[in-house]
């Protein structure tokens, strides 16, 4: 819909859409994982949230220096975690706050499972149910 040049049109807000991938990662302990967020444009800073359990509220991710790194250029934001540990298990969300509208958009989440708690088959089955 049109705003008739009276106000910034939310439809035209450059960060009104955000795609996160992959939806699920299963890796053995010690591996490096990357998760990505794709945005319409770099019109707002991206931060990363994390929650351990499905029914928890996501919290701001505390980046562990030297092991966790976030990067953003243009319309791609990436979170890299090196040497993954069991305590990294959980769901990671990227979140973008629009510079002009202050509206916040959140990705659908990437679930990370560090191998060792269950078999790969069980994890795959869980992912199918989740989707």
């Amino acid at each position: 819909a049109r705003s008739e040049d009276r106000y910034r049109n939310p439809k035209g807000s450059a960060c009104s859409r955000i795609w996160q991938s992959p939806r699920f990662i299963a890796r053995k302990r010690g591996f490096t994982v990357k998760m990505h967020c794709y945005m319409n444009s770099a019109s707002g800073n991206v931060s990363w949230l994390w929650k351990q359990e499905m029914d928890e509220n996501p919290q701001q991710l505390k980046l562990e220096k030297g092991r966790m790194e976030e990067s953003q250029n243009e319309s791609l934001a990436t979170l890299t975690i090196q040497g993954i540990r069991f305590e990294d298990n959980g769901i990671y969300f990227c979140q973008q706050k629009c510079n002009n509208t202050s509206e916040v958009y959140q990705g659908c989440g990437t679930e990370l499972r560090v191998m060792g708690f269950s078999t790969l088959a069980q994890l795959k089955q869980r992912n199918t149910l989740k989707d």
Partner: antibody
Framework: QVQLVQSGAEVKKPGASVKVSCKAS????????VNWVRQAPGQGLEWMGM????????HYNQMFNDRVTMTVDTSTSTVYMELSSLRSEDTAVYYC??????WGQGTLVTVSS | DIVMTQTPLSLSVTPGQPASISCKSS???????????LNWLLQKPGQSPQSLIY???KLDSGVPDRFSGSGSGTDFTLKISRVEAEDVGVYYC?????????FGGGTKVEIK
């Protein structure tokens, strides 16, 4: 010509809900955002939120703490604004407006016990 | 939220004389695409508001050219070159660059 015709005045008790309607005519209904603005007696203007009639996308003013809901009926070119958990401070004239350019005549909502 | 501050609160003007209303925003209203969503409304006694000016200086259709808007960033002005009796009412500036949309407190213009 563009017209926004609102429903009549309402008197409500604290804690109740009110639903105000706004019927649009004279233009392609789904082409423009519809905003809701309220004005308490003798006071200024306060933006409540807006809705895109083409897909029902809404943007609300957070100060209303999830008390406001805007909906649309494209078959009748009507937008609705519902405000719940009413309190005396919600006594105001409620306006629907097309992009704050064309305005409805206003609906007085009085909240009183 | 963006705070819009209007001055003066009220204005008493002799017909045919100029009038000026100031509007200041707590943050710049220039958006990333180069547009400044600063608008002016007039609410005549007992009526719904009517739009006068949008994008700082563009006059709405039917608005007399004695009205003009100017400004940039955070400082804006509405001018009436020669006030007429029909110009009485409360003038509001409002911004549409940042959500939520916010209005100034209003300036009441009356005729001496």
């Amino acid at each position: 010509q563009v017209q926004l015709v609102q429903s009549g005045a309402e008197v409500k008790k604290p804690g109740a809900s009110v639903k105000v309607s706004c019927k649009a005519s004279g233009y392609t209904f789904t082409d423009y955002w519809v905003n809701w603005v309220r004005q308490a007696p003798g006071q200024g203007l306060e933006w409540m939120g807006m809705i895109d009639p083409s897909d029902s996308e809404t943007h609300y003013n957070q100060m209303f703490n999830d008390r406001v809901t805007m909906t649309v009926d494209t078959s009748t070119s009507t937008v609705y604004m519902e405000l719940s958990s009413l309190r005396s401070e919600d006594t105001a004239v409620y306006y629907c407006t097309r992009s704050n350019y064309y305005w409805g005549q206003g609906t007085l909502v009085t909240v009183s016990s | 939220d963006i705070v819009m501050t209007q001055t003066p609160l009220s204005l008493s003007v002799t017909p045919g004389q100029p009038a000026s209303i100031s509007c200041k925003s707590s943050q710049s209203l220039l958006d990333s695409e180069g547009k400044t969503y600063l608008n002016w409304l007039l609410q005549k006694p007992g009526q719904s508001p009517q739009s006068l000016i949008y994008l700082v200086s563009k006059l709405d259709s039917g608005v007399p050219d004695r009205f003009s808007g100017s400004g940039s960033g955070t400082d804006f002005t509405l001018k009436i070159s020669r006030v007429e009796a029909e110009d009485v009412g409360v003038y509001y500036c409002w911004q549409g660059t940042h959500f939520p949309l916010t209005f100034g407190g209003g300036t009441k213009v009356e005729i001496k």
